[in-house]
C-alpha cells in the first residue's frame, strides 16, 4: 500500500470485557467524507469489511460482528458491544473521497482476574527433602491479558534462587478467551517456615491503571526432626497426694516422635517403662507417695530407629501418712486428767492441731493435748489435724473419743407431747453415759434402739394413746454398772383442727409422731416445758 | 498421553508382604508425585501413602508402621510395600498422579484379596 | 483429620434430570476439593478441581461449586453414561474423601 511506511501509530483504545468499545474515525473532513466510511477489522493482517457507512447511514457486514456495531456521533464513531478478548485487533476507518484514506484504532482489551485461589502441600514438606518441594499453588483464573504473579514470604516477595525457590507459571486459555494462570511455588523449606505466612499477588492492568489480587495468606506444614525432648509435670509447682498429675513428653520435632516415659526404680536402679494414654501423657490419678521417683522419656523416629532421651525430671509427690493418736481409746473417770499425742509422717514439715469435734473449737496448736480435771462435758471427740502449712489441702485428721466414767446422763428430763387418742405415737428418748446405758419404757408398745456413738444411746417407741396412757403419761429410764436416770414424757390432748402447719416440726432432741389406729398417718407435735431442763 | 498401570499379585496370605508396582508413562516421576489409594469392596475410597515429585514420602498414619514407598525414575515406576497383610486389607489399589496436589490421572487398579 | 461427608449414598433419576451431590467438611478446606467418577473396571476419572473449575475433556453437563465447608456436583442434565459413583476429596490438609453417591438411571 502507497505511502504504509509513513503511517502513524494507531490510535490507542482501552476497554473491559463485556463493555462497549467507542471507534472515533479519525478521519479530518480533508482525509475523507465521513458520510461514506467502510469500517474493516484487521486480524492476522488480513482486513475484513465490517460496517458500511453511506449518506450517513450504518450498515453491518454479515459475519462475526454483525449483532454488536453501531453509528453514534452522528456517524463519525463505531460503537462496538459486549468486547471479548477476540476483539483486540486494529480497526481501520476508510473514507472514500476526495481520495481514500485510512485512519487505525489499536483497540486493548482487559478483564481483572478472580481472586487468587491459593493452596497448600496438603501433605507438607519436610526438611530434608533432597529438592525443593510444591509448596503451594496460586490460581488466577479469567483475566485478560495474562497476570503477572508474585510470590511473598512473610511480606517479602520470593525471588528464584537455584535449588531453593522456584517459580513454575503456566496459563491455559479458556473458550472465551480468557487466561487461566497457575504459578507454583517450589522450595526447600527450613525449619524457622514452620510459622511463616505465604501468599500470591496478581498484577493486572485496566483501563483505569495497574492493579493487584492478594490470596488469603497461608501456613505450609513443615517436618523436621527432633533435636531436643523434654517432660512437663501438670499441675507445677508442689504435688500432694489425691492430686491429678500428668507427666507430658514433648519433643521440638513434627511430626512429634513416638514417647515411651519410664520411671527409675530406687532398689533396681533400672527405668521401668509407665503406661501412657494414646497421647503418651502418663496420668497419676490419684497420686500416691509411691508415684514419686526419677521420671525420663524416650522419644523415637520411627523412620529411623534413633532414640532421644529426655533429662531426668524428680517427681515428688508430698504426703501425710496416717495419723496415730496414744491413746487411741481413752477412758477417765470426773476429776482425772489426761494427755493425748498425735503423730504423723510427712515429706514435708508438719503442724499438729486438736480440734473439739463437736465444736471445731481449735483447743491445742501441737501434737500434744493436754486435759485437766475432766468433768462429765469433756467426754466425746477429739481431732488430731497433721497438716503441711506450705500445700494447702495437704492434711490427714485421727478422730479420738473420751469416754467419762459416770450414770446415765438424759437429754431432757421432761418433755410435753400433744397427742390425740388412738393415735399411735412415736416417742424417742436419748441418754448417754459410760458405760453405754440402756434404755426401758414404763409402757408396752413397740421399742427399738441405736447407738448414736459409744456413749450415747436412742430408744424409740411406738405406742397407742389411750385415757389410761393419757393420765399416767410416759417414762423411760437409762440404766447402767454406774446407775440410773429417768425422764418423764406428758401426753397432752390437743384439737387436731388447731394444729397449724408450722406445728408439724419437731422441736427439741426426742420426735413423737402420732398417727391415728386405722394408721393414717397425722403428725403430733411434742414442745418442750417452758422451764430449763434438769440434766442428770 | 498419560497412563499409569499397577501391577502385583492378585492373592496374598496373611501376615504376607504385599508389593504393589505403579508404572507411569507420559510424565516424568521427577514432576509429578504420585499417590496409593484403595478401595475396600463396598466402601470408600482411601489414601494410603505418597511420594512427591522431591522424593518425599508421606504415609497415612493409620498403615505407617506397615507402609514403603519408594521410586525409580529411570524405570517410571513407584513401588508399594505393604508388610503383615490381612484380610481387611483386601481392595482394589490404585496409582494416582498429583497435579500437584489433587489426582488428575489414575490407573485402572488391581484388585488383591487376602485369604489363606 | 478432616472428615467429608457425602449425601445422598445413593440416587436413582431419569435420563435428562438435573442431579446433585453435596459434599460436607468437617472444617473449612477453602476451594481444596475434587470430585471424581468411577465406574467398575474403568480408570477413576476427575471431573471437578478446586471445587468449581472442569477438568478438560469433561462435559460441561458436570459443574461444581462451594467453598468452605459445603460443596455440590451438579449434572444439568443426566445422561446413561453417567451412571457410576461419584466421591469427592478434599486436598486442603492430607487427603481423605468422602463415602461416595451411587448415581443410577430410572
Known amino acids: 500500500v502507497p505511502g504504509e511506511a509513513e503511517q502513524p501509530a494507531p490510535e490507542l483504545v482501552e476497554v473491559e470485557v463485556g463493555s462497549t468499545a467507542l471507534l472515533k474515525c479519525g478521519l479530518s473532513q480533508s482525509q475523507g467524507n465521513l458520510s461514506h466510511v467502510d469500517w474493516f477489522s484487521v486480524h492476522k493482517e488480513k482486513r475484513t469489511l465490517i460496517f458500511r457507512v453511506r449518506q450517513g447511514q450504518g450498515q453491518s457486514e454479515p459475519g462475526e460482528y454483525e449483532q454488536r456495531l453501531s453509528l453514534q456521533d452522528r456517524g463519525a464513531t463505531l460503537a462496538l458491544t459486549q468486547v471479548t478478548p477476540q476483539d483486540e485487533r486494529i480497526f481501520l476507518c476508510q473514507g472514500k473521497r476526495p481520495r481514500s484514506q485510512e485512519y487505525r484504532i489499536q483497540l486493548r482489551v482487559y478483564k481483572a482476574p478472580e481472586e487468587p485461589n491459593i493452596q497448600v502441600n496438603p501433605l507438607g514438606i519436610p526438611v530434608n527433602s533432597k529438592e525443593p518441594e510444591e509448596v503451594a499453588t496460586c490460581v488466577g483464573r479469567n483475566g485478560y491479558p495474562i497476570p503477572q504473579v508474585i510470590w511473598y514470604k512473610n511480606g517479602r516477595p520470593l525471588k528464584e534462587e537455584k535449588n531453593r525457590v522456584h517459580i513454575q507459571s503456566s496459563q491455559t486459555v479458556e473458550s472465551s478467551g480468557l487466561y487461566t494462570l497457575q504459578s507454583i511455588l517450589k522450595a526447600q523449606l527450613v525449619k524457622e517456615d514452620k510459622d511463616a505466612q505465604f501468599y500470591c499477588e496478581l498484577n493486572y492492568r485496566l483501563p483505569s491503571g495497574n492493579h493487584m489480587k492478594e490470596s488469603r495468606e497461608v501456613t505450609v506444614p513443615v517436618f523436621y526432626p527432633t533435636e531436643k525432648v523434654w517432660l512437663e509435670v501438670e499441675p507445677v509447682g508442689m504435688l500432694k497426694e489425691g492430686d491429678r498429675v500428668e507427666i507430658r513428653c514433648l519433643a521440638d520435632g513434627n511430626p512429634p516422635p513416638h514417647f515411651s516415659i519410664s520411671k527409675g526404680n530406687p532398689s533396681t536402679r533400672e527405668a521401668e517403662e509407665e503406661t501412657t494414654n494414646d497421647n503418651g501423657v502418663l496420668v497419676l490419678e490419684p497420686a500416691r507417695k509411691e508415684h514419686s521417683g526419677r521420671y525420663e522419656c524416650q522419644a523415637w523416629n520411627l523412620d529411623t530407629m534413633i532414640s532421644l532421651l529426655s533429662e531426668p525430671q524428680e517427681l515428688l509427690v508430698n504426703y501425710v501418712s496416717d495419723v496415730r493418736v496414744s491413746p487411741a481409746a481413752p477412758e477417765r473417770q470426773e476429776g482425772s486428767s489426761l494427755t493425748l499425742t498425735c503423730e504423723a509422717e510427712s515429706s514435708q514439715d508438719l503442724e499438729f492441731q486438736w480440734l473439739r469435734e463437736e465444736t471445731d473449737q481449735v483447743l491445742e496448736r501441737g501434737p500434744v493435748l493436754q486435759l485437766h480435771d475432766l468433768k462429765r462435758e469433756a467426754g466425746g471427740g477429739y481431732r488430731c489435724v497433721a497438716s503441711v502449712p506450705s500445700i494447702p489441702g495437704l492434711n490427714r485428721t485421727q478422730l479420738v473419743k473420751l469416754a467419762i466414767f459416770g450414770p446415765p446422763w438424759m437429754a431432757f428430763k421432761e418433755r410435753k407431747v400433744w397427742v390425740k387418742e388412738n393415735m399411735v405415737l412415736n416417742l424417742s428418748c436419748e441418754a448417754s453415759g459410760h458405760p453405754r446405758p440402756t434404755i426401758s419404757w414404763n409402757v408396752n408398745g413397740t421399742a427399738s434402739e441405736g447407738d448414736q456413738d459409744p456413749q450415747r444411746v436412742l430408744s424409740t417407741l411406738n405406742v397407742l394413746v389411750t385415757p389410761e396412757l393419757l393420765e399416767t403419761g410416759v417414762e423411760c429410764t437409762a440404766s447402767n454398772d454406774l446407775g440410773k436416770n429417768t425422764s418423764i414424757l406428758f401426753l397432752e390432748l390437743v384439737n387436731l383442727t388447731t394444729l397449724t402447719p408450722d406445728s408439724n416440726t419437731t422441736t427439741g432432741l426426742s420426735t413423737s409422731t402420732a398417727s391415728p389406729h386405722t394408721r393414717a398417718n397425722s403428725t403430733s407435735t411434742e414442745r418442750k416445758l417452758p422451764e430449763p431442763e434438769s440434766r442428770g | 498421553q498419560v497412563t499409569l498401570k499397577e501391577s502385583g499379585p492378585v492373592l496374598v496370605k496373611p501376615t504376607e508382604t504385599l508389593t504393589l508396582t505403579c508404572t507411569v508413562s507420559?510424565?516424568?516421576?521427577?514432576?509429578?508425585?504420585v499417590s496409593w489409594v484403595r478401595q475396600p469392596p463396598g466402601k470408600a475410597l482411601e489414601w494410603i501413602a505418597a511420594?512427591?515429585?522431591?522424593?518425599?514420602?508421606y504415609y497415612n498414619s493409620a498403615f505407617k508402621s506397615r507402609l514403603t514407598i519408594s521410586r525409580d525414575t529411570s524405570k517410571s515406576q513407584v513401588v508399594l510395600t505393604m508388610t503383615n497383610m490381612d484380610p481387611v486389607d483386601t481392595a482394589t489399589y490404585y496409582c494416582?498422579?498429583?497435579?500437584?496436589?489433587?489426582?488428575?490421572?489414575w490407573g485402572q487398579g488391581t484388585l488383591v484379596t487376602v485369604s489363606s | 483429620d478432616i472428615q467429608m461427608t457425602q449425601s445422598p449414598s445413593s440416587l436413582s433419576a431419569s435420563v435428562g434430570d438435573r442431579v446433585t451431590i453435596t459434599c460436607k467438611g468437617s472444617?473449612?478446606?477453602?476451594?481444596?476439593l475434587a470430585w471424581f467418577q468411577l465406574k467398575p473396571g474403568k480408570v477413576p476419572k476427575l471431573l471437578i478441581y478446586?471445587?468449581?473449575s472442569l477438568q478438560t475433556g469433561i462435559p460441561s453437563r458436570f459443574s461444581g461449586s462451594g467453598s468452605g465447608t459445603d460443596f455440590t456436583l451438579t449434572i444439568s442434565s443426566l445422561q446413561p453414561e453417567d451412571v457410576a459413583t461419584y466421591y469427592c476429596?478434599?486436598?486442603?490438609?492430607?487427603?481423605?474423601f468422602g463415602g461416595g453417591t451411587k448415581v443410577e438411571i430410572k
Open positions: 511420594i512427591s515429585s522431591g522424593g518425599s514420602t
Open positions: 494416582a498422579r498429583h497435579r500437584p496436589f489433587y489426582f488428575d490421572y
Open positions: 478446586d471445587a468449581n
Open positions: 507420559g510424565f516424568s516421576l521427577t514432576s509429578n508425585g
Open positions: 472444617q473449612n478446606i477453602y476451594k481444596s
Open positions: 476429596q478434599q486436598y486442603y490438609s492430607g487427603y481423605t
